[in-house]
């Protein structure tokens, strides 16, 4: 039950990073135009990824996109790699995630195989809010730059009479959206990978199964022998015969070498 | 069609309050804000402020102590009130719409005149 | 506050001929957002209200003859008519429409020779 726990709600906090990996993405504010200790402008200026826009006081709001590939800084170049790599890996992760959840039956799939695909679509959502906080951090750490070389450049005089304002620009919403969606991606993944581990059985070279027989006697089946225990490539235990002998389906533990009654 | 009325008393006594009021008709104060303008006689025009369509309010600086634009949506009207007022306050007053493009003023009232006199 | 200087105070103009009035600011009305300038021209005709000419420092409001041009960028502007008329008599203003408080020039008084 914990193990179908940990999973699902790995599965929704990944869902939920991912979707705001994509929400950030696609945002325009990730660098807004810096109103402090600045002169009041009747124009808002704000960028993201994609494209810049102006925001008048009218409410009049025009956007143009950065038609240009070759033109483009390759730090922002960069962080849509990181951002598109970080949706794509989550988007895959998603899917077979999907198909792993325990509390879903697909055909006659095995828990070991649950298991791996758990585990990969765990590492995949860890990869996945890394590249989203990397790709956050990094244009964060280039507005911070240029914050700092605009402050140094703001008032440049122009023979002393007339003076030009250079915009700076700050941190936008979309960077606080990537931080926290990254972050709850990688939170995802960790949790399905903890499932994972919940999920697969424990592999050894001796694996026995414990049953009552009818008398005071107690009988041991040592694994290794496949045609006598059901054991061997097998991971899953199977029932013999009826006789008081139990899976670990029924008794939720895993049989290993010290499993002896 | 887009129309901007100006109303209030023609003459105020110093030190007392200017109240006046724009009744629009022809567009929505949701959507569109209104800037307000005085012109002293045979002098060039003054800025006093404006109300965009979200509330916010922008003054002139030298102005700012006195004056306060406000918006009355059920009555489709924008008012002005200046306080204070002194000899120097005298001009024709008006209020024009701010175009949705370009921060420009693209629909004017007639204008009001308004004398400060004891 | 953005100091809007005009010239000249008076321009006498011919009929059919061309007029040209200037404006400087005293700060960029440039926006590097979108490339902009927040510049705004205003006729005032006699006994009249302003009336809105142009915006962005170059586009003519709609309904304004294309004998009204506007140019220029960051400080220095320029609003060109280019065969006057006589009912385009009348004072001429610049406005920066960019920082608060907006501030208008001092005006161009436009008359037939």
């Known amino acids: 039950m914990a193990v179908t726990a940990c999973q699902g709600l790995g599965f929704v906090v990944s869902l939920i990073g991912i979707a705001g990996i994509i929400a950030a993405t696609c945002m325009d504010q990730w660098s807004t135009q810096d109103l402090y200790n600045n002169p009041v402008t009747a124009v808002f200026n704000y960028q993201g990824l994609w494209r810049s826009c102006v925001r008048e006081s009218s409410g009049f709001t025009e956007c143009r996109g950065y038609f240009t590939l070759l033109g483009l800084p390759a730090m922002l170049q960069a962080v849509r790699a990181l951002m598109i790599v970080g949706i794509v890996l989550g988007a895959i992760g998603l899917l077979v995630s999907i198909f792993a959840l325990k509390c879903i039956r697909i055909g006659s799939m095995e828990d070991s195989a649950k298991a791996n695909m758990t585990l990969t679509s765990g590492i995949m959502f860890i990869v996945s809010g890394l590249c989203a906080i990397a790709g956050v951090s990094v244009f964060a750490n280039m507005l911070v730059t240029n914050f700092w070389m605009s402050t140094a450049n703001m008032y440049t005089g122009m023979g002393g009479m007339v003076q030009t304002v250079q915009t700076r620009y700050t941190f936008g919403a979309a960077l606080f959206v990537g931080w926290v969606a990254g972050g709850l991606t990688l939170i995802g993944g960790v949790m399905m990978c903890i499932a994972c581990r919940g999920l697969a059985p424990e592999e050894t070279n001796y694996k026995a199964v414990s049953y009552h027989a009818s008398g005071h006697s107690v009988a041991y089946k040592p694994g290794g022998f496949k045609a006598s225990t059901g054991f061997g490539s097998n991971t899953k235990n199977k029932k013999i015969y009826d006789g008081g002998a139990r899976t670990e389906d029924e008794v939720q533990s895993y049989p290993s070498k010290h499993d002896y009654v | 069609q887009v129309q901007l009325q100006e109303s209030g008393p023609g003459l105020v006594k110093p030190s007392e309050t200017l109240s006046l009021t724009c009744t629009v008709s022809g567009f929505s104060l949701t959507t569109y804000g209104v800037h307000w303008i005085r012109q002293p006689p045979g002098k060039g025009l003054e800025w006093i402020g404006v109300?965009?369509?979200?509330?916010?309010?922008n003054y002139n600086s030298a102005l700012m102590s006195r004056v306060t634009i406000s918006v009355d949506t059920s009555k489709n009207q924008f008012s002005l009130k200046l306080s204070s007022v002194t000899a120097a306050d005298t001009a024709v007053y008006y209020c024009?719409?701010?175009?949705?493009?370009?921060?420009?003023?693209?629909?004017w009232g007639q204008g009001t005149m308004v004398t400060v006199s004891s | 506050d953005i100091v809007m200087t005009q010239s000249p105070l008076s321009l006498p103009v011919t009929p059919g001929e061309p007029a040209s009035i200037s404006c400087k600011s005293s700060q960029t009305l440039l926006n590097s957002g979108n490339q902009k300038n927040y510049l705004t021209w205003y006729l005032q005709k006699p006994g009249q209200s302003p009336q809105l000419l142009i915006y962005?420092?170059?586009t003519g409001e709609s309904g304004v003859p294309d004998r009204f041009s506007g140019s220029g960028s960051g400080t220095d502007f320029t609003l060109k008519i280019s065969r006057v008329e006589a009912e385009d008599v009348g004072v001429y203003y610049c406005?920066?429409?960019?920082?608060?408080?907006?501030?208008f020039g001092g005006g161009t008084k436009v008359e037939i020779k």
């Open positions: 962005w420092a170059s």
């Open positions: 109300i965009w369509a979200g509330g916010s309010t």
């Open positions: 406005q920066n429409a960019y920082f608060y408080p907006f501030t």
């Open positions: 024009a719409r701010a175009a949705y493009y370009g921060n420009g003023l693209d629909y």
